[in-house]
């Protein structure tokens, strides 16, 4: 058993049929010695008396808010949550496996640049009695500070018969060094509580591996005289790290016909312009990627050819 | 070439070679063998390799003030990785394919380090750690980890040389 926060405790249980459970001793936070009784949740049934209460925690029916009283007055509370371990593996019932980029990916994170700011998100099908708390650091043995905001519900989607809820959080490394080569990963830890179930999820990454630039901006076409060719130009996104001579991007320019089956013409360039042939009803798209480190491509920025 | 006393390196040549190194480091990575182990090998070998850190002067401001600190750090790393790529980790079982880009990568690391270090002038180099793989699966795991950290190292080096070529070239 360990304390999650004041008066909230997590009991770790091996979860299998007829498991013996854990013996837990609760102590009433009071100078009083006599006449103390204990109840669980809203029930008025007295579970025991005395300054301490010993219980065998085996299942969710044994978890909840234990309250000690004296003469009708509440003295203190202890909320017990359960953390299940099945066959040596902690349960992951609350969050959905996003399966990208690999199985057992519950948290996904992205950064728009090297400033040390990043966003993480996760999915659940649970709509009520759900709380999240997020902590982060750079490294784990001698952790350096990363400040995270509160997790918020950022999207709702309907998937078949189910509703899916997306939560996200923004974090900022306290003393980021954008030009350095990271040697210690960022660690993100999410505590999730649904009713009386506690779970924790972690992700470990380097900012360089979660970089996804915003799409190029100001995408423009300039027809070339007496030619089917056009000059496409664009600019670095505002959110990308500066100076651009140091934090350089590379670009992919694509000409795509109306039909998805039509052959795509692609050009790769380090410049912020390219010359392509504009076909009727086609569109031109450009996306960006870090020039020197193959993290994610941005989403496409597009303009019609006409 | 860099010369003692802090003259400029051939920024443009270094830029081209470091960009080639980036490409080679990424093309070598998937080709060192099928690898599920990398998904689980969470303990970092990167504690054992030189990093371009915050105080090394490799940021734009530091390069403007005095690029020598940064170039020395890059040179140290290039020699270090060149030694690792020539070690038993990459030459032992399982054998790399004959056309593996690791050979080219090895040669390019040496080429860039020579561009940075003139004859008769020696910067300190770091000892190569004893990672002591005794099994082929351990070598394979280390190859992935070393190439992953090399990708990060050469990305910073390439940014340094690109910025130098754009702003510090004579």
């Amino acid at each position: 058993i360990w304390e999650l926060k004041k008066d909230v405790y997590v009991v770790e249980l091996d979860w299998y049929p007829d498991a013996p459970g854990e013996m837990v001793v609760l102590t009433c936070d009071t100078p009083e010695e006599d006449g103390i009784t204990w109840t669980l949740d809203q029930s008025s049934e007295v579970l025991g008396s005395g300054k301490t209460l010993t219980i065998q925690v085996k299942e969710f029916g044994d978890a909840g808010q234990y309250t000690c009283h004296k003469g009708g007055e509440v003295l203190s509370h202890s909320l017990l949550l359960l953390h299940k371990k099945e066959d040596g593996i902690w349960s992951t019932d609350i969050l959905k496996d996003q399966k990208e980029p690999k199985n057992k990916t519950f948290l996904r994170c992205e950064a728009k640049n090297y400033s040390g700011r990043f966003t993480c998100w996760w999915l659940t099908t649970i709509s009520t009695d759900l709380t999240f708390s997020v902590k982060s650091s750079r490294g784990s043995s001698d952790p350096q500070g990363v400040t995270c905001g509160a997790a918020t519900l950022s999207a709702e989607r309907v998937r078949g018969d189910n509703k899916e809820y997306e939560y996200s959080v923004e974090c900022q490394e306290d003393s980021a060094c954008p030009a350095a080569e990271e040697s210690l990963p960022i660690e993100v830890m999410v505590d999730a509580v649904h009713k009386l179930k506690y779970e924790n999820y972690t992700s470990s990454f380097f900012i360089r591996d979660i970089i996804k630039p915003d799409p190029p901006k100001n995408l423009q076409l300039k027809p070339l005289k007496n030619s089917r060719q056009v000059e496409v130009s664009w600019e670095y996104p505002d959110t990308w790290s500066t100076p651009h001579s140091y934090f350089s991007l590379t670009f992919c320019v694509q000409v795509q016909g109306k039909s998805k089956r039509e052959k795509k013409d692609r050009v790769f360039t380090d410049k912020t312009s390219a010359t392509v042939i504009c076909r009727k009803n086609a569109s031109i798209s450009v996306r960006a990627q870090d020039r020197y480190y193959s993290s994610s491509w941005s989403e496409w920025a597009s303009v019609p050819c006409s | 070439r860099a010369v003692p006393g802090g003259s400029s390196p051939a920024w443009t040549q270094c830029q081209q070679l470091s960009q080639k190194l980036c490409t080679l480091a990424w093309s070598a990575h998937p080709l060192v063998g099928h690898m599920d182990l990398r998904e689980e090998g969470d303990e970092e070998t990167t504690n054992d390799v030189p990093h371009i850190q915050c105080g090394d002067g490799c940021d734009p401001q530091g390069l403007r003030d005095n690029s020598q600190f940064c170039l020395q750090r890059i040179h140290q790393g290039l020699i270090f990785y060149e030694k690792l790529l020539g070690s038993d980790i990459f030459t032992g079982e399982p054998s790399l394919l004959p056309d593996s880009p690791v050979g080219q990568l090895h040669a390019s690391l040496l080429g860039l380090s020579q561009l940075l270090q003139p004859e008769g002038h020696h910067w300190e180099t770091q000892q190569i750690p004893s990672l002591s793989p005794s099994q082929p699966w351990q070598r394979l795991l280390l190859r992935f980890k070393i190439l992953r950290s090399l990708q990060a190292f050469v990305a910073v080096a390439a940014r340094v040389f690109a910025h130098g070529a754009a702003t510090l070239s004579p």
């Epitope: - | 063998g33 090998g41 099994q135 394979l140 795991l141």
Partner: antibody, heavy 121, light 111 residues
């Protein structure tokens, strides 16, 4: 289908040399390492040695001086030679494939049926 | 050499009940976060069969009532609901250092 089949004498005399052959099919010896493992009657398993994809070998230090493992990739055969046999070497000898280096980390994923070798005069 | 000590030596479990076998190594069998510990099942007259590789990965074709956990020096094989066909001897094996070594085996029977 992956198969490994051990062949060789059932009975050898003390001080003689044992030669066992493992013939494999369904995979190439240039892609997978082969180990030899033995099991005395009613006892636990003992690893003898391995021949890697490139032909290098590692042996159990306890019997290293008596062991040689070689292979012929084109014939898909691995040969175990063990000199100066003794009654304590009586065991079932297994030829075993080591799983893909990058996934299995030294786990042995396919085993032959084994061949029982008795050392007796 | 790395010595692997299995416990218990034998285990009698009722059908449908849980069986847990432990394997302790005399030194760590982890290398940069990878546990080179594997589990085998051997039935009478048959060669061993790989069940779990790298401490916790289920070999294809093995029922998911088998699971493995642990790292460094302490490892566990669990059969969540024992079936009649699970009666066998179970061995752990390490491949972190030469020579590869096996545990002494744990015999699982039905109570």
């Amino acid at each position: 289908e992956v198969t490994l089949k051990e062949s060789g004498p059932v009975l050898v005399k003390p001080t003689e040399t044992l030669t066992l052959t493992c013939t494999v099919s369904g995979f190439s010896l240039t892609s997978y390492a082969i180990s030899w493992v033995r099991q005395p009657p009613g006892k636990a398993l003992e690893w003898l040695g391995v021949i890697w994809t490139g032909g290098g070998t590692n042996y159990n230090s306890g019997i290293k001086s008596r062991l040689t493992i070689s292979k012929d990739n084109s014939k898909s055969q691995v040969v175990l030679t063990m000199t100066n046999m003794d009654p304590v070497d009586t065991a079932r000898y297994y030829c075993v494939r080591e799983g893909d280096y990058g996934s299995y980390a030294g786990a042995m994923d396919y085993w032959g049926q084994g061949t029982t070798v008795t050392v007796s005069s | 050499d790395i010595v692997l000590t299995q416990s218990p030596d034998s285990l009698a479990v009722s059908l449908g009940e849980r069986a847990t076998i432990n394997c302790r190594a005399s030194e760590s069998v982890d290398y940069y976060g990878i546990s080179s510990m594997h589990w085998f099942q051997q039935k009478p007259g048959q060669p061993p069969k790989l069940l779990i590789y790298r401490a916790s990965n289920l070999e294809s074709g093995i029922p998911d009532r088998f699971s493995g956990s642990g790292s460094r020096t302490d490892f566990t094989l669990t059969i969540s609901s024992l079936q009649a066909e699970d009666v066998a001897v179970y061995y752990c094996q390490q491949a972190n250092k030469d020579p590869y070594t096996f545990g002494g085996g744990t015999k699982v029977e039905i109570k």
